[in-house]
């Protein structure tokens, strides 16, 4: 028969022969022959291959370096890489999570819209009218101004995005 020019899924063409790819978690030791199936070997400890492949070396699991603020979120297997995340209070600098930076704090006048996670930074938003934040924080949302009326008080000093209103007693003379 004519030698093949293309092979089925999960096969590869080598020296005019279609050979089976190695399954995830295994590496190629030797190509198939007309008489022998593809030789594959399981990846070693701390190694992985996550696709059907013809790789002769497995990939090393990612190392979550504590010196870079990293810790293991999910331990790798022979078929999956280790997933790193950042220590509490830190987040990844990239999607690959190769290093961490301290969560950003929202300055006075800004509140936390979304608290940071191991993979995303704090999202801040300006405090709208009626709200304020007087601290630099990675957790505090904008607080609503105090409602003087509900306390039978009047506004003595208007609030800003950084300060609360100041309430005072009602001016009895105006009664």
């Amino acid at each position: 028969p004519e030698p093949p020019t293309a092979c089925r899924e999960k096969q590869y063409l080598i020296n005019s022969q279609c050979c089976s790819l190695c399954q995830p978690g295994q590496k190629l030791v030797s190509d198939c022959t007309e008489f022998t199936e593809t030789e594959c070997l399981p990846c070693g400890e701390s190694e992985f291959l996550d696709t059907w492949n013809r790789e002769t070396h497995c990939h090393q699991h990612k190392y979550c370096d504590p010196n870079l603020g990293l810790r293991v979120q999910q331990k790798g297997t022979s078929e999956t890489d280790t997933i790193c995340t950042c220590e509490e209070g830190w987040h990844c600098t990239s999607e690959a999570c190769e290093s961490c930076v301290l969560h950003r704090s929202c300055s006075p006048g800004f509140g936390v819209k979304q608290i940071a996670t191991g993979v995303s930074d704090t999202i801040c938003e300006p405090c709208p009218v009626g709200f304020f934040s007087n601290v630099s924080s990675a957790f505090e949302k904008c607080h609503p101004w105090t409602s003087c009326e509900t306390k039978d008080l009047v506004v003595q000093q208007a609030g800003t995005n950084k300060t609360d209103v100041v309430c005072g007693p009602q001016d009895r003379l105006r009664a």
Epitope: N15, S30, D31, C32, T33, E34, F35, T36, E37, E39
Partner: antibody, heavy 117, light 109 residues
Framework: QVQLVESGGGVVQPGRSLRLSCAAS????????MHWVRQAPGKGLEWVAV????????YYADSVKGRFTISRDNSKNTLYLQMNSLRAEDTAVYYC??????????WGQGTMVTVSS | EIVLTQSPGTLSLSPGERATLSCRAS???????LAWYQQKPGQAPRLLIY???SRANGIPDRFSGSGSGTDFTLTISRLEPEDFAVYYC??????????FGGGTKVEIK
């Protein structure tokens, strides 16, 4: 460890039969093609036969075609060579060897077959 | 059928010397699927080189293979006492039959 051990050799008269066995261990036998190779006393290596991993494909050297049959039992991790109508020129050490894309990478220690009246 | 011719038939050398063994094919060997085997008296052959130039597992780097097409060479850079043996080349791509060369005996001078 990976090992092939041949057995079944001996002295036999011309025209008679003999069956050689090759016991495999230390690897997944059912995934590998297997060969028989022989070596007459003081001579070089001569390929005899090959069988595919599942036993479907078989090829023979012209010198043994029609007289020798290669077979395997994957459940027993064993390769066989049935030798009929033996001749004096079949006298040799018979080796089994594992087939790979790297050539014959593992060989047994051999079993001696002597055809003599 | 490919015929493999090995030369010389015998090579007489001293330990420490360089050995150069030749294997010539009657037609081109497909994909350079050519192997070299070492055989010592009373022992089975041992795979040394495959794919014309790749060393098999555990083979010392003093053994090297080269060549393609019809001309192949096995070189032993510095002969050790345990290297004195018979060496065979073999074509394992163009079958049937699988062919072996006639062998080269490397003996102590």
């Amino acid at each position: 460890q990976v090992q092939l051990v041949e057995s079944g050799g001996g002295v036999v008269q011309p025209g008679r039969s003999l069956r050689l066995s090759c016991a495999a261990s230390g690897f997944t036998f059912e995934k590998y093609g297997m060969h028989w190779v022989r070596q007459a006393p003081g001579k070089g290596l001569e390929w005899v036969a090959v069988i595919s991993y599942e036993g479907e494909k078989k090829y023979y050297a012209d010198s043994v075609k029609g007289r020798f049959t290669i077979s395997r039992d994957n459940s027993k991790n064993t390769l066989y060579l049935q030798m009929n109508s033996l001749r004096a020129e079949d006298t040799a050490v018979y080796y089994c060897a594992r087939d790979t894309s790297r050539g014959h990478d593992i060989w047994g220690q051999g079993t001696m077959v002597t055809v003599s009246s | 059928e490919i015929v493999l011719t090995q030369s010389p038939g015998t090579l007489s050398l001293s330990p420490g010397e360089r050995a150069t063994l030749s294997c010539r094919a009657s037609q081109s060997v497909s994909y350079s699927y050519l192997a070299w085997y070492q055989q010592k008296p009373g022992q089975a052959p041992r795979l040394l080189i495959y794919g014309a130039s790749s060393r098999a597992n555990g083979i010392p780097d003093r053994f090297s293979g080269s060549g393609s097409g019809t001309d192949f060479t096995l070189t032993i850079s510095r002969l050790e006492p345990e290297d004195f043996a018979v060496y065979y080349c073999s074509d394992y791509a163009d079958y049937p039959p699988f062919t072996f060369g006639g062998g080269t005996k490397v003996e102590i001078k």
